[in-house]
């Protein structure tokens, strides 16, 4: 992507309070594959409503259904996964919510309540009956698929039964499961049955087996665990913000940019400009001016007004938001017609968005 | 996954100028600000600066905007702290961290006659 | 620059004991803080992010809170690999100032 010659600074400056970005971590919905997710706009009064996902307007499709202010998702795949935003349009202003969606082989966080009644998971059998491993308990088992943040204990239980008693072991993605394999270790409770890893973390994920056995038969289940990573993440802007314009010469126009962050961001307003009659400096890179950015003297940075324009202002509106994790940007185009030409809005063009990973 | 491999211990002369190096793995090398921390023998955690490597944007900590140069060259995905006119008083461990959650694992900078 | 001050500078406590270290900064940081645990020879980790958000990888012992110049860095039941030097950090604007640290010592 391209690099700028900056007529002014562009590098992270002392930014405004944080009056207008919705810094609090979204809400996460979770979904394993092939299933469907229906979500409802958490917003009020909503004469319009559009969506977006990671920025990039979202419009339906074989597999998604918009349908007033819910979303259904059909069939989820973990592409689907990412910060998804409703924006509600109204007669006098518009407002965003964000949330995301994590689809993964993963459903729900761990159980890890304590074995408190673990005693009755394990069932002595008449010496008599002689009997392969069955399953005790197959309501304990039926969450196969464990989302859980990072840090937190898992614990993955296959209560059985059988004569003799049988005897459990672990794999992890096929492969037996040694202490070493992961720091810490882990804790096996061959009274509960369970297995116990605490503080988990990303190379935690993978497939627990456990493979329950006796001299008559072996019997096995396997959980899926995902471990969902917390870290601040760089800004992200509305897709379609800010959108082309056009205006005569002497009128006014705005351009806006929506930003979620959650970190405190500042914003930037840049312009392609010429110096000394020349838009590129002696390196071949283009001019750029700051003409508004966010900090203690800007009011809403995320709107710039330009007043009576002229059409040495028509050109391209680059909006660029940072945080001390990243970067994003995008642009408008404003078009000055003469006086005699009708302005008119122009088609709205999303700009090509800053993709998170 | 995410790793910050520093290059390695240097002793310099007051007045030289040093050069560390942080090479950055396991993301997406151009998303993400390399800040640069400092720690001298007994003192605190001091911000030098950060590169967006993206676009080549810097911003330096005023104390060291005349003696410090970033630089990132995204075909290696490594991001260089240039730190001229050393004095014995940079003397420190220094950090190149990306957005502060990952750090490599610090380079020992002596400057000694 | 906005300086951070972090109290106390040192602080002795027994495992199992509940731990508070406060930050203050000179001016309001609208919740743009970072916490981070440094030992010796080792490089600083991420903690908490955004005054009250835990980190990849942090046990939820550890907790943060605060607003506007008053920050908390809480660790509800020490356990013996937590005693290390803290940092908080100001991460609102450029410097982004850390305070001088609070050392956590065993008693």
């Known amino acids: 992507r391209p690099s700028f010659s900056l007529v002014e600074d562009t590098t992270l400056e002392p930014e405004e309070p944080p009056t207008k970005y919705q810094i609090s971590q979204p809400e996460v919905y979770v979904a394993a594959p092939g299933e469907s997710l229906e979500v409802r706009c958490l917003l009020k009064d909503a004469a319009v409503i559009s969506w977006t996902k990671d920025g990039v307007h979202l419009g339906p499709n074989n597999r998604t259904v918009l349908i007033g202010e819910y979303l259904q998702i059909k069939g989820a795949t973990p592409r689907d996964s990412g910060l998804y935003a409703c924006t509600a349009s109204r007669t006098v202003d518009s407002e965003t919510w964000y949330f995301m969606v994590n689809v993964t082989d993963a459903i729900s966080s761990g159980d890890d309540e304590d074995d408190t009644d673990g005693a009755e998971d394990f069932v002595s059998e008449n010496s008599n009956n002689k009997r392969a491993p069955y399953w005790t308990n197959t309501e304990k088992m039926e969450k196969r698929l464990h989302a859980v943040p990072a840090a937190n204990t898992v614990k993955f239980r296959c209560p059985a039964g059988g004569n003799p008693m049988p005897t459990m072991r672990w794999l992890k993605n096929g492969k037996e499961f040694k202490q070493e394999h992961r720091i810490g270790g882990y804790k096996v409770r061959n009274q509960h049955w369970s297995l116990i890893m605490e503080s988990v973390v990303p190379s935690d994920k993978g497939n627990y087996t456990c493979v329950v056995e006796n001299e008559y038969g072996s019997i096995n289940h396997t959980y899926h665990l995902d471990v969902v990573e917390r870290s601040p993440h760089r800004p992200i802007l509305q897709a379609g913000l800010p959108a082309n314009a056009s205006t005569v010469v002497g009128g006014d126009v705005e351009f806006v940019c929506k930003v979620y962050s959650d970190a405190q961001p500042h914003i930037q307003w840049i312009k392609h400009v010429e110096k000394n009659g020349s838009k590129y400096g002696p390196d071949g890179l283009p001019y750029l001016k700051v003409l508004k950015h966010s900090g203690i003297n800007s009011s809403n940075a995320e709107v710039l007004a330009l007043f009576n324009v002229t059409e040495a202002d028509a050109g391209e509106y680059i909006c660029k938001v940072s945080n001390y994790i990243g970067q994003a940007n995008q642009s408008a185009w404003l078009t000055v017609l003469p006086k005699q030409q009708a302005p008119g809005r122009e088609k709205e063009i999303t700009a090509s968005p800053d993709y998170l990973e | 996954q995410v790793q910050l491999v520093q290059s390695g211990a240097e002793v310099k002369k007051p007045g030289a100028s040093v050069k560390v190096s942080c090479k950055a793995s396991g993301y997406i090398f151009t998303n993400y600000y390399i800040h640069w921390v400092r720690q001298a023998p007994g003192q605190g955690l001091e911000w030098m600066g950060a590169?967006?490597?993206?676009?080549?944007?810097?911003s330096y900590n005023q104390r060291f905007k005349v003696r410090a140069t970033l630089t990132a060259d995204t075909s290696t995905s490594t991001v260089y702290m240039e730190l001229s006119s050393l004095r014995s008083e940079d003397t420190a461990v220094y950090y190149c961290?990306?957005?502060?959650?990952?750090w490599g694992q610090g380079t020992t900078v002596t400057v000694s006659s | 620059d906005i300086q951070m001050t972090q109290s106390p500078s040192s602080l002795s406590a027994s495992v199992g004991d509940r731990v508070t270290i406060t930050c203050g900064a000179s001016e309001n940081i609208y919740g743009a803080l970072n916490w981070y645990q440094r030992k010796p020879g080792k490089a600083p980790k991420l903690l908490i992010y955004g005054a009250t958000n835990l980190a990849d990888g942090v046990p939820s012992r550890f907790s943060g809170s605060g607003s506007g110049t008053d920050y908390t860095l809480t660790i509800s039941s020490l356990q013996p690999e937590d005693f290390a030097t803290y940092y908080c950090?100001?991460?609102?604007?450029?410097?982004?100032?850390f305070g001088g640290g609070t050392k956590l010592e065993i008693k």
């Open positions: 961290a990306r957005a502060f959650t990952y």
């Open positions: 590169i967006y490597p993206d676009n080549g944007d810097t």
């Open positions: 950090q100001n991460v609102l604007s450029t410097p982004y100032t």
